[in-house]
Interface confidence: medium
Amino acid sequence: PPRGRILGGREAEAHARPYMASVQLNGAHLCGGVLVAEQWVLSAAHCLEDAADGKVQVLLGAHSLSQPEPSKRLYDVLRAVPHPDSQPDTIDHDLLLLQLSEKATLGPAVRPLPWQRVDRDVAPGTLCDVAGWGIVNHAGRRPDSLQHVLLPVLDRATCNRRTHHDGAITERLMCAESNRRDSCKGDSGGPLVCGGVLEGVVTSGSRVCGNRKKPGIYTRVASYAAWIDSVLA
């Protein structure tokens, strides 16, 4: 089943997010991902925890998952590198790098996204864009076309309140508001983009979606710059 958590969003402009990837298992969408280099897609480590007996591939240049599109191409995966400290059952270090079988063919609809290297929190209230093919309602309806939503960043202190995530949000994580608009199941591994720069990756715990007291949790990529660079080197 797809992992992660977009509720309350709308259909994205086709191919306006050329960095967007669909991580697929046995030909079906599993998680989001983001092209960070010609041959590398960043996603969430949890996405692979149940994929051991399946074929993992990455779809780039897509808006619709099912319809033919000139820019769409499915890539095999050469190497899957989860963060070495990731655990299947915690949200910490929930990052995965997938090396494509070959360099992606770049164009208007396929382009890597610059990612944040300066390890500094995004200012609370900043509007950031999250996109994905995750479920769009509580009944579990999955969209065929890419959805997106703008979400304000939530300060860590509020996110860590006992009524919210009760101290689980470390300095390597960030939160975004989740009042009816939220990332949801199937969006895990997808990008949180602030000012045209990748700031976060949707984590893939089993959080309820669209509840303002359970904000969306995102892994801060700047906190993992050294690891990302070491794998891509």
Epitope: D53, L78, V81, S86, D89
Partner: antibody, heavy 121, light 111 residues
């Protein structure tokens, strides 16, 4: 320091039942998957069962040799882990180890000292 | 099930020499660039101890004389130089597919 302490082993007759326990300490128990692995006297190791955490809906997995007879469970509030064994057979005689696994590659990194189960008529 | 065949079943090595234990899998244990193969050491009356994960990663606290190599279906554990403390049974184990399986074991003795 990670510690796993098994208990509940004993001598019983075929078709009998037994419940093994494992007390865990020294790590955040509720975020780890746990396993039972057994070793018959003078023999090799055999993986028996695995249970994942709450965030993975406590998914369970069993070896074919124990399926429908053994049940794995856990109590996160007590950091306890269990193996309920029914319809025991002589070939279930073994040392039973409680084992933690870590990471996406399912590495069994910490093992308890084991508890002995003997099934004999 | 993936069957792991270890060889030799027993091995006698002089102190200071090299011991090599092999493990062959009935099918590949590769998972997108990582070999899901572990090695354990078990001394009499003790539980197994993890030595090496993912074919070649030596666990923290394990002496540098232990090393692992291999990919696909063929793997080996090397101990060099062998010390008295290394007398034990050694097992390989795959975590590529459930059920996870172990090799039959290799008994290391000192000549």
């Amino acid at each position: 320091e990670v510690q796993l302490v098994e208990s509940g082993g004993g001598l019983l007759q075929p078709k009998g039942s037994l419940k093994l326990s494992c007390a865990a300490s020294g790590f955040t128990f509720n975020t780890y998957a746990m396993n039972w692995v057994r070793q018959a006297p003078g023999k090799g190791l055999e993986w028996v069962a695995r249970i994942r955490s709450k965030s993975s809906n406590y998914a369970t997995y069993y070896a074919d040799s124990v399926k429908d007879r053994f049940t794995i469970s856990r109590d996160d509030s007590q950091s306890m882990f269990y193996l309920e064994m029914n319809n025991l057979k002589t070939e279930d005689t073994a040392m039973y180890y409680c084992v933690r696994d870590r990471g996406y590659y399912y590495v069994m990194d910490y093992w308890g000292q084991g508890t002995s189960v003997t099934v004999s008529s | 099930d993936i069957v792991l065949t270890q060889s030799p079943a027993s091995l006698a090595v002089s102190l200071g020499q090299r011991a090599t234990i092999s493990c062959r899998a009935s099918e590949s244990v590769e998972y997108y660039g990582t070999s899901l193969m572990q090695w354990y050491q078990q001394k009499p009356g003790q539980p197994p101890k993890l030595l090496i994960n993912a074919a070649s990663n030596v666990e923290s606290g394990v002496p540098a004389r232990f090393s692992g190599s291999g990919s696909g279906t063929d793997f080996s554990l090397n101990i060099h130089p062998v010390e008295e403390d290394d007398i034990a049974m050694y097992f390989c184990q795959q975590s590529r597919k459930v059920p996870w399986t172990f090799g039959g074991g290799t008994k290391l003795e000192i000549k």
